[in-house]
């Protein structure tokens, strides 16, 4: 959470941004809020990126103006135009690229004053893991797969019964480059699993952490997955 202040004569406005992460190839949001101003035509929103000449996006006089936009953002940006009057200057970013990572500035000018705040935007790839029983294996095994990760994550297994156990000797993890030559498919196999136990497959890089749980009993298989972004907010 970053709060910036601006001074315009005697007036300043508070601008607030949130550090966030973008998933390569998906859509992202760079969050920015400011003190609302009912005079839409008097609001100017400028998004800038450190090290880039030109703007990421500009919204003024109630509409977009991309005449100064840098080419790398062409056709990929928009503000939530109907939410500007209530103080939302967040930027939609289409088709997030690895090169979109960096420091952004949300600059606001309203009839109340000026203000700005920076945010760090991380980019990578992260996806939910899916765990299945691997019936092809000679012994009872679990297969944990996640389709898109970058940078290369670490993978660890855990067990509810054998808490603290090191499963690195009885697991095998591989990383397969996807067709776009950036992200990778993660596959990890855990061997010699026992029934009536809950196993967890944890995949983590510096952007996200994902966990897949599986419980295998005689009568059923229960699965659960979750994904959390790291260092956001």
């Amino acid at each position: 959470l970053i709060i910036g202040f601006g001074i315009s004569g005697k007036h300043f406005i508070t601008v607030t941004t949130f550090t966030s992460a973008g998933n390569i190839g998906e859509d992202g949001t760079l969050s920015c809020t400011f003190e609302p101003d009912i005079k839409l035509n008097g609001i100017v929103i400028q998004w800038l990126k450190e090290g880039i000449k030109g703007l990421v996006h500009e919204f003024k006089e109630g509409k977009d103006d991309l005449s100064q936009q840098h080419e790398m953002f062409r056709g990929r940006t928009a503000v939530f135009a109907d939410q500007v009057v209530v103080g939302n200057a967040s930027l939609r970013l289409k088709n997030v690229q690895l090169t979109d990572a960096g420091t952004y500035t949300c600059y606001i000018h309203t009839s109340k004053g000026k203000g700005n705040a920076n945010l760090e935007y991380k980019t990578g790839a992260f996806s939910m893991p899916e765990i299945n029983v691997d019936y092809n294996a000679s012994s009872e095994s679990l297969r944990c797969e996640a389709p898109r990760w970058f940078p290369q994550p670490t993978v660890a297994w855990a067990s509810q019964v054998d808490q603290g156990a090191n499963f690195s000797e009885v697991s095998n993890t591989s990383f397969e480059l996807n067709s776009e030559n950036v992200t990778m498919k993660v596959v990890s196999v855990l061997y010699n699993v026992t029934i009536n136990n809950t196993y967890s497959c944890m995949i983590e890089n510096d952007i996200a952490k994902a966990t897949g749980d599986i419980k295998v009993t005689d009568s059923e298989v229960k699965r659960r997955s979750q994904l959390e972004l790291l260092n956001s907010g």
Partner: antibody, heavy 121, light 107 residues
């Protein structure tokens, strides 16, 4: 209500330059919320996006045609134009101008009627 | 470039039929997909944008679904004016590309 209309020669000789203009009426192409595109359709075939232009003059061209395409804009006349050089019979098509529906949503919500350009000697 | 593959290339149907057209992208395009209707001698008309959003003025019998690589256009009850060619278009990555089209013909 904004309308688009293509104009230009219907017949172009091989190796020459195809020139088309799209004129907007009932609204301004200087509205910052839109990109303006050219799209073509070969006879009986599918659609091919040629490129787009912003009112400020910045352009993006389809790499498959980039070496031969030039787009320009004249906001005072509320027009944008397409030039395609070194044409061959393969450039015979109906050429459409169109508006992209927003700065981020690159679908085409408004089209001209289209103009058939035949490349023949 | 992202390749857009439509199927079937043509379909014969009767008034009142439910018609489904599919479009597959060669790589993930999130929900950045549009559908158009084109009648002979006319410009294409936008029906659906962002995979499932109905363009203003388009009848509700048209609907779109899908995300990632697989998308569907459905006409719930075919009307006489719906006989036309339909195209999908990806709006995710330059250069924007169209599917080859699906012709909906009278059975």
């Amino acid at each position: 209500q904004l309308q688009l209309q293509e104009s230009g020669p219907g017949l172009v000789k091989p190796s020459e330059t195809l020139s088309l203009t799209c004129t907007a009426s009932g609204g301004s192409i200087s509205h910052g919320g839109y990109y303006w595109s050219w799209i073509r359709q070969h006879p009986g075939k599918g659609l091919e996006w040629i490129g787009n232009i912003y009112y400020s003059g910045s352009t993006y061209y389809n790499p498959s045609l980039k070496s031969r395409v030039t787009m320009s804009v004249d906001t005072s006349k509320n027009q944008f134009s397409l030039k395609l050089s070194s044409v061959t019979a393969a450039d015979t098509a109906v050429y459409y101008c169109a508006r992209e529906s927003s700065t981020i949503s690159a679908d085409f919500d408004l089209w001209g009627r289209g103009t058939l350009v035949t490349v023949s000697s | 470039d992202i390749q857009m593959t439509q199927s079937p290339s043509s379909v014969s149907a009767s008034v009142g039929d439910r018609v489904t057209i599919t479009c597959r992208a060669s790589q993930g395009i999130s929900r950045w997909l549009a559908w158009y209707q084109q009648k002979p001698g006319k410009a294409p008309k936008l029906l659906i944008y962002a995979a499932s959003s109905l363009q203003s003025g388009v009848p509700s019998r048209f609907s779109g679904s899908g995300s990632g690589t697989d998308f569907t256009l459905t006409i719930s009850s075919l009307q006489p004016e719906d006989f036309a060619t339909y195209y999908c278009q990806q709006a995710h990555t330059f250069p924007y590309t169209f599917g080859g089209g699906t012709k909906v013909e009278i059975k």
